[in-house]
């Protein structure tokens, strides 16, 4: 692989424009951040591959690495990549900003790890710090990483002065986490239970040997004991097993269930929790809203969600009007109901392309031997607006009239404008809106119909133009929610013999 | 200087709404979960509702479920608490604050307090 | 949801006094636990995560112990910008809980 400019390193001006050029055997790409930005890929006529990477308008957050790799690695060398470090020293830009995953350091052993601080500008001094503190501490910094070294369970911020600007760091919280040999799961058939019914509980380990298994839970605190079951799940080799079950469970016996596993030979120990809730009796509860009023529009497909928690699991039914809707087979319909998590259910009603007959009063209902509840709203059907007629007369009293006829839903709003210099108007000049209460020379009158059938709004509108002296291009435009549309007519003065 | 101011408090009568918003500087906002709390005349605290980093995880006390909704804007580095169907125990100084939960670990999840709080901003749910 | 009761209510002392305020969970929080002083008309500040975790910051005369269900808050020495109500405040899947809180005025 070539790259050019080589680097390693690269200083940049913030605002210029800067190209880096990639070759080699087989396709080539760039990489930044583990993504490949838009560049250009090209091939040459002596086999060789390029992708050229061009950076615009410079800004101090395109600091960082870039790499250029093989696109396709068979048959090549797959690790086979070049590294290329760019600054670009920006005042406005104090620390690079890092991800949740990069403030938060765990460690499992006392290892060297960075504290990945970085800034624009190489010629930066640097300083770290425990998060409160001023005392600089003695660890080595690389612009490219950051402060590499050994560090204790503590919170760390890095220092820079840019210009006259102290500048500090988000925290870096380095923590130790106590690992032990002993791997430890708990489980629970179910974790949501009614009065009466059984709560059971496992606890593996695996690879050990011999374990003491300890459990505490809420009926133990009250002195009322449950003796576990311990065993070997033996097509595995050294899983033990502890099942603690508690028939007939009783309100009282909610809360965390914790199984603590002790190895004594190396004296290892871990310990898991889980959640137990004994119910009264089964539950169904809506989360989150749903408005009462639903929108859909004409042809396009719309699916309409319900999110809720139950125990047990519930009946779904939807209904339309009162009456049952099920799963149509020309596929106009899809219900489903997915169980999202142990209690958390979502249901869904799809409606295929939508018709202006599946507008209406919609209801889901969700429930079981204990409970229920039910959902319902409105689907108004929203219908794009369409000019159906725009026509020009001019009766007997000498005005002219222009009406205009349209449909949709909701009801559409019209709008009349005029062009009275044919040649400038609309292009150079905008057009002049009509029908405005102060303009004396043209009145407007509007009739608004709704057609049950259809479920839409028909508008009426008629202009009327006391005195037309030269051509005028009359407009009118419709406009709802979902859409607009504009026809417009010529009209004449009465003392033309011709219309355009 | 980190730093998290709060506003849009004020009077509003039984049922009403509002907005509170916190806007956040000196520090990588989008990077943390957020927390709002809230402080009634002379009681002690109590955690209102939180966030996680980029919106898609939310969590609430069971007395406001339904009626506050929080949400952020990371852009504007902004967090909000929208309020409806207010009563009069929702009275009360509200406090945002940052909530310094880690990516979760395997199976584990670390928490290390809130570390960094707003002044508050009070609102008051009277006739 | 998972309780949280604090001991004593209010608590009176003197400067250089040792102080201990309680904190008990209605179930075991394992060591998710943190501890927060707040004055008159102020935020709170934090002061111990994890139970035992001295914050950034924070005076070496505060300590905190206990695992659980019980845990404690120590002064070593009381100074006068101690004086304040303090709060234990668990967390558990994300939801929050605090402590009615812990008075510590001048005797």
């Known amino acids: 692989l070539v790259v050019t400019p080589p680097g390693p390193e690269l200083v940049l001006n913030v605002s210029s424009t800067f190209v880096l050029t990639c070759s080699g055997s087989a396709p080539v790409v760039w990489e930044r951040m583990s993504q490949e930005p838009p560049q250009e890929m090209a091939k040459a006529q002596d086999g060789t591959f390029s992708s050229v990477l061009t950076l615009t308008n410079l800004t101090g957050l395109d600091t960082g690495e870039y790499f250029c790799t093989h696109n396709d690695s068979r048959g090549l060398e797959t690790d086979e990549r070049k590294r290329l470090y760019i600054f670009v020293p920006d005042p406005t830009v104090g620390f690079l900003p890092n991800d949740a995953e990069e403030l938060f350091i765990f460690l499992t052993e006392i290892t060297e790890i960075t504290i990945p601080c970085r800034v624009t500008d190489p010629q930066l001094v640097v300083t770290l710090h425990e998060k409160k503190g001023d005392v600089a501490l003695p660890v080595p910094y690389d612009h490219q990483r950051g402060f590499s070294g050994i560090f204790e369970d503590r919170s760390y911020i890095c220092k820079t002065t840019i210009g006259d600007r102290e500048v500090d760091s988000d925290a870096y919280y380095v923590y130790r986490l106590q690992v032990s040999s002993i791997n430890v799961s708990v489980n629970a058939v179910q974790t949501v239970v009614r009065q009466g019914e059984n709560i059971t509980l496992m606890c593996i380990v695996i690879g050990n040997e011999v374990v003491n298994f300890e459990w505490t839970y809420p009926r133990k605190e009250s002195g009322r004991l449950v003796e576990p079951v311990t065993d070997f799940l033996l097509d595995m080799p050294y899983h033990i097993r502890s099942i603690l079950h508690i028939p007939s469970a009783e309100l009282e016996d909610s809360g965390t269930y914790t199984c603590n596993v002790t190895e004594s030979v190396n004296d290892h120990q871990d310990e898991k929790a889980i959640n137990i809730t004994v119910v009264e009796s089964g539950y169904v509860r809506l989360l989150g809203e749903v408005g009462t009023l639903q929108f859909a529009e004409l042809h396009r497909s719309r699916t309409l969600q319900v999110v809720f928690e139950a125990y047990p699991p519930p009946t779904v039914l939807w209904f339309k009007d009162n009456r049952t809707l099920g799963d149509s087979s020309a596929g106009e319909i899809a219900l489903s109901t997915r169980n999202v998590s142990e209690t958390r259910y979502v249901s869904e009603l799809t409606l295929v392309r939508v018709k202006v007959a599946e507008a209406g009063h919609y209801t889901m209902r969700a429930f079981h031997e204990d409970a229920e509840v039910q959902l319902s709203f409105q689907l108004q059907i929203n219908v794009p607006v369409r000019v159906l007629e725009l026509s020009e007369s001019h009766p007997d009293s000498g005005e002219q009239t222009v009406r205009c006829r349209g449909r949709g839903m909701p009801q559409p709003n019209i709008i009349w404008s005029a062009c009275r210099d044919l040649k400038r108007c609309p292009r150079e000049l905008p057009p002049t809106l009509l029908g405005n209460s102060s303009e004396e020379e043209s009145q407007l009158e509007t009739n608004v119909t709704y057609w049950e059938e259809e479920q839409e709004f028909e508008v009426v509108s008629t202009l009327r133009l006391q005195h037309v002296d030269r051509p005028l291009s009359v407009r009118c435009t419709l406009r709802n929610a979902v859409g607009q549309d504009t026809q417009e007519v010529i009209v004449v003065p009465h003392s033309l013999p011709f219309k355009v | 200087e980190v730093q998290l101011v709060e506003s849009g408090g004020g009077l509003v009568q039984p049922g009403g709404s509002l907005r509170l918003s916190c806007a956040a500087s000196g520090f990588t906002f989008s990077s943390y979960w957020m927390s709002w709390v809230r402080q009634a005349p002379g009681k002690g605290l109590e955690w209102v509702a939180n966030m996680n980093q980029d919106g898609s995880e939310t969590h609430y006390v069971d007395s406001v479920k339904g009626r506050l909704s929080i949400s952020r804007d990371n852009a504007k580095k902004s967090l909000f608490l929208h309020m409806n169907s207010l009563r009069a125990e929702d009275t009360a100084v509200y406090f945002c604050?940052?909530?310094?939960?880690?990516?979760?670990?395997?199976?584990?999840?670390?928490?290390?307090?809130?570390?960094?709080w707003g002044h508050g901003t009070t609102v008051t749910v009277s006739s | 949801d998972i309780q949280m009761t604090q001991s004593p209510s209010t608590l009176s002392a003197s400067v250089g006094d040792r102080v201990t305020i309680t904190c008990r969970a209605s179930?075991?929080?394992?060591?998710?636990l943190a501890w927060y002083q707040q004055k008159p008309g102020k935020a709170p500040k934090l002061l111990i995560f994890k139970a035992s975790t001295l914050e950034s910051g924070v005076p070496s005369r505060f300590s905190g112990s206990g695992s659980g269900t019980e845990f404690t808050l120590t002064i070593s020495s009381l100074q006068p910008d101690d004086f304040a109500t303090y709060y234990c405040?668990?967390?558990?899947?994300?939801?929050?809980?605090f402590g009615q809180g812990t008075k510590v005025e001048i005797k």
């Open positions: 405040q668990q967390y558990n899947s994300y939801s929050r809980t």
């Open positions: 179930q075991s929080i394992s060591d998710w």
């Open positions: 604050a940052r909530d310094l939960v880690p990516p979760r670990q395997d199976d584990y999840y670390y928490y290390f307090g809130m570390d960094v």
